[in-house]
């Protein structure tokens, strides 16, 4: 092992961590969990204790960016360097960034949770065997109901585990048709479709009608994405494989490096390459996510790299499903910081963790044969920032509510949108919402159906806010908006007529600006916006950190609340006060506990 | 010992080619960023390129940039720069530099090893 | 880019005495600053890294200070060998740049 001259350390030994963004390669838990795994590497062996925070003052700052992201060190692209970190120390010192060009996995491909099966929602293992032959993406082989699906070990024919995989033949996410599957064909606009289209959205989102008229019904659903099969290069990067294809006159189900003398996998993305030459490379193994940071974690904690090519600290990746650390890594560590206290714990395991098994429905026999009951639980969730609005017209009136412990606003973890509307707090999350008025004792009421009150809008909402001389609301879902006055609404109207770009994908607040004025918030950006002109001045877009310094950069909504500004990400708020012309974070909280004042047990 | 060693300058045609290369020893090569910094005469210090320790990133100055390229060997412990389309104002030495960063333990800046140069001048 | 100034752009002392060159960021580097000195006809050669990291060999007269956007390099009491042209250098965001020198001679 080696460490820099005057072994460069932390003088503390509670080291906190703060998430800063994430990959859209992995779910948000996969990444947190590799991150915590990584660092619990290390303290198994060492004094530390590393905990996760949010805020920007954490000692250990994790980041993905590509290319040049705000430092002297720019990433390369795809492969060559993954990621890099700084030794410990005041402000970036310390910090953690992961180039986002990589394909960020568990080592082992892409990571496709399942659903339904009989392997309680575990990750597809890719490759898999089934009949004998390797599949190194979901595949419908074997069904006749077009479902794909995966084993969820390296051999279905041995192991007889399978789960199916985001299909929308299984469920569609948001929309307005509760998550059910898409009906192929449907008809939308006099023409006849048999698979997910964009047709009719300007977000490039695939959507489909839940039953055979979408001109009839207008109920519709997003169908959900396939990381296992969507191309990197050739000539259709981003689009999915299509299986089975024809090459050469021969049929293929799954990807092949036929026709390649590197050995690649690649895959044609229309059903014959032959004719249509539309084609693109499959998902390959991707980094570990895991692996990359415990060795980054290693930088950040002071061990520079280690001349032992069995040890983590070794600057070249390898992929190992073994104990990562090697005994000159426990060796350099403990040089700067010492052993753990007695007594020894057990070494961290360092397998997954099993995603939480889907919702009851009935089971679905293997893959040969066809199931009994097409699955019908809705999807564990819509995307963070997933489209919510309709190809072209506001969805129908949402269903009653089932009763169930998410009805007390106090176990609602994260919040669709926030506002204050009239002297009220409402707070809105999966077709419901709830009124808060602030007092002693003073709980969350509801919740309500956001279709009785508001029948036009979707389940899903990015934010809201109240104008307050004309008293319109103004509800924003994905790349739409409708305006509500009193009863009558206005819309869904595209972002366009707004005057944002096509580069805004949804809204995710608003805060007053001056009479007449708002400012409207996407993501790191944020513009002036005219309330009677319904117009934003292109001009006056902003970075949302040189207005608001202190917040953070992924907040998910933003509102304003008894003249203060606040800033959510996660379940938590930063809490903004401006005093002579200087905004400053003056507090970060719970929205749970500390705004609803909910109890903390 | 660290080394580092230049060599192909030389006198050139503007529009011409040169390849320089730097000869590394003393050091695990393939573990750093090596750079490629030149001076014009009686001037100040220019970065002009780097090259990451795969080879796969490499960055170059605006002023050289489509003109020149970086490359390495790390079998050979040998860092290059094709030069092309040479121009007057390229006149300068040029020296290979190896960084104290790894390509992924930053946060090191600094170029702790030099070479001792080597002369390129671009004239008619 | 960010720019790097450096200040006098000529200074002259006599040995033994005290020498403090400037070196200031045109926006916050944090710490990622490098001092190099520079003979007639030889090659940079590192001072000082990350603002204040004496580097391998260098004798303990030199010190490096500063953080943000100002930096100091101070030689606490100046020997015949260390008269030759200094130069900061920046790495705190991409890409790097070097300040044009400041040139140290005998009074």
């Known amino acids: 092992f080696q460490t820099f001259e005057g072994d460069l350390k932390w003088h503390h030994h509670n080291i906190t961590y703060w998430i800063q963004n994430y990959s859209e390669d992995l779910p948000r838990a996969v990444i947190d969990d590799a991150f915590a795994r990584a660092f619990a590497l290390w303290s198994a062996v060492t004094p530390l204790t590393f905990t996760r925070v949010y805020s920007r003052d954490a000692d250990i700052v994790i980041q993905f960016g590509v290319a040049e992201h705000g430092d002297g060190y720019p990433f390369d692209g795809k492969d060559g360097l993954l990621a890099h970190a700084f030794p410990p120390g005041p402000g970036i010192q310390g910090d953690a960034h992961f180039d986002d060009d990589e394909l960020w996995s568990l080592g082992k491909g892409v990571v496709v949770p399942t659903r339904f099966g009989n392997a309680d929602g575990a990750a597809c293992h890719f490759p898999f065997i089934f009949e004998g032959r390797s599949y190194s993406a979901c595949t419908t082989d074997g069904r006749s109901d077009g479902l794909p699906w995966c084993s969820t070990t390296a051999n279905y024919d041995t192991d007889d585990r399978f789960g199916f995989c985001p299909s929308e033949r299984l469920y569609t996410q948001d929309g307005n048709a509760d998550g059910k599957p898409c009906q192929f064909p449907f008809i939308f606009q006099g023409q006849s479709y048999s698979a997910c289209t964009t047709d009719g959205r300007s977000d490039g989102y695939r959507w489909c009608a839940t039953t055979a008229n979408y001109d009839r019904d207008k109920l519709f659903g997003f169908c959900p994405t396939r990381a296992d099969s969507t191309v990197m290069g050739g000539n259709s990067a981003g689009e999915l494989c299509v299986f089975p294809f024809t090459f050469l006159g021969k049929e293929y189900s799954t990807c092949t490096s036929e026709g390649r003398g590197d050995g690649r996998l690649w895959c044609a993305t229309t059903s014959n390459f032959d004719s249509d030459k539309k084609w693109g490379f499959c998902p390959d193994q991707g980094y570990s996510l895991f692996l990359v940071a415990a060795h980054e974690f290693g930088h950040a904690l002071g061990l520079d790299h280690s001349s032992v090519p069995e040890a983590l600290m070794y600057p070249m990746y390898r992929f190992t499903e073994g104990p990562p650390l090697h005994k000159d890594d426990v060796n350099g560590i403990r040089h700067l910081y010492g052993p753990r206290p007695e007594p020894e714990p057990r070494p961290p395991t360092t397998t997954t963790p099993q995603p939480t098994a889907p919702p009851t429905v009935c089971p679905t026999g293997p893959p040969t044969v066809h199931p009994s009951e097409r699955p019908t639980a809705g999807p564990t969730g819509p995307p963070s920032a997933g489209p919510t609005g309709p190809p072209t017209a506001g969805p129908s009136t949402a269903t009653t509510v089932p009763l169930s412990p998410v009805d007390d606003a106090c176990n609602v973890n994260i919040f669709d949108a926030i506002a204050e509307i009239g002297n009220q707090l409402y707070l809105f999350k999966d077709g419901k919402y709830w009124r808060f008025s602030e007092g002693r004792g003073s709980r969350p009421q509801g919740p309500f159906l956001i279709a009785d009150k508001w029948p036009a809008l979707p389940r899903k909402l990015d934010s809201v806010f109240e104008e307050r001389l004309s008293k319109k609301l103004f509800f924003f879902s994905g790349r739409q908006v409708w305006v509500y006055t009193g009863a009558s609404v206005l819309g869904p109207r595209r972002l366009d007529k707004l005057g944002l770009g096509a580069d805004v994908a949804q809204v995710t607040g608003a805060l007053r600006s001056g009479r007449g004025k708002m400012l409207l918030f996407s993501g790191r950006r944020l513009w002036r916006f005219d309330v009677k002109a319904q117009m934003v001045d292109p001009r006056s877009a902003s970075e949302v950190d040189r207005m608001f310094p202190g917040v953070p950069l992924d907040t998910h909504d933003v509102f304003q609340y008894r003249e203060k500004a606040y800033f959510c990400q996660d379940r938590f708020y930063w809490r903004v006060s401006s005093r002579s012309e200087l905004n400053q974070v003056d507090q970060v909280g719970y929205v749970t506990y500390d705004i609803l004042q909910c109890p903390e047990d | 010992e660290v080394q580092l060693l230049e060599s192909g300058g030389g006198l050139v045609q503007p529009g011409g080619s040169l390849r320089l290369s730097c000869a590394a020893s003393?050091?695990?090569?393939?573990?750093?960023n090596m750079w490629w910094v030149r001076q014009a005469p009686g001037k100040g210090l220019e970065w002009v390129s780097?090259?990451?320790?795969?080879?796969?990133?490499?960055f170059y100055a605006d002023s050289v940039k489509g003109r020149f390229t970086i490359s390495r060997d790390n079998s050979k412990n040998t860092l290059y720069l094709q030069m092309n389309s040479l121009r007057a104002e390229d006149t300068a030495v040029y020296y290979c530099a190896k960084d104290r960063a790894y390509g992924d333990y930053v946060g090191w800046n600094g170029f702790d090893y030099w070479g001792q140069g080597t002369l390129v001048t671009v004239s008619s | 880019d960010i720019q790097m100034t450096q200040s006098p752009a000529t200074l002259s002392l006599s040995p033994g005495e005290r020498a403090t060159l400037s070196c200031r960021a045109s926006q916050s580097i944090s710490s990622f600053l490098a001092w190099y000195q520079q003979k007639p006809g030889q090659a940079p050669r590192l001072l000082i890294y990350?603002?204040?990291y004496r580097a391998t060999g260098i004798p303990a007269r030199f010190s490096g200070s500063g953080s943000g956007t100002d930096f100091t390099l101070t030689i606490s009491s100046l020997e015949p060998e260390d008269y030759a042209v200094y130069y900061c250098q920046q790495r705190g965001n991409w890409p790097i740049t070097f300040g044009q020198g400041t040139r140290l001679e005998i009074k």
């Open positions: 780097v090259i990451y320790p795969s080879g796969g990133g490499t």
């Open positions: 003393g050091f695990t090569f393939s573990w750093y």
């Open positions: 990350d603002a204040s």
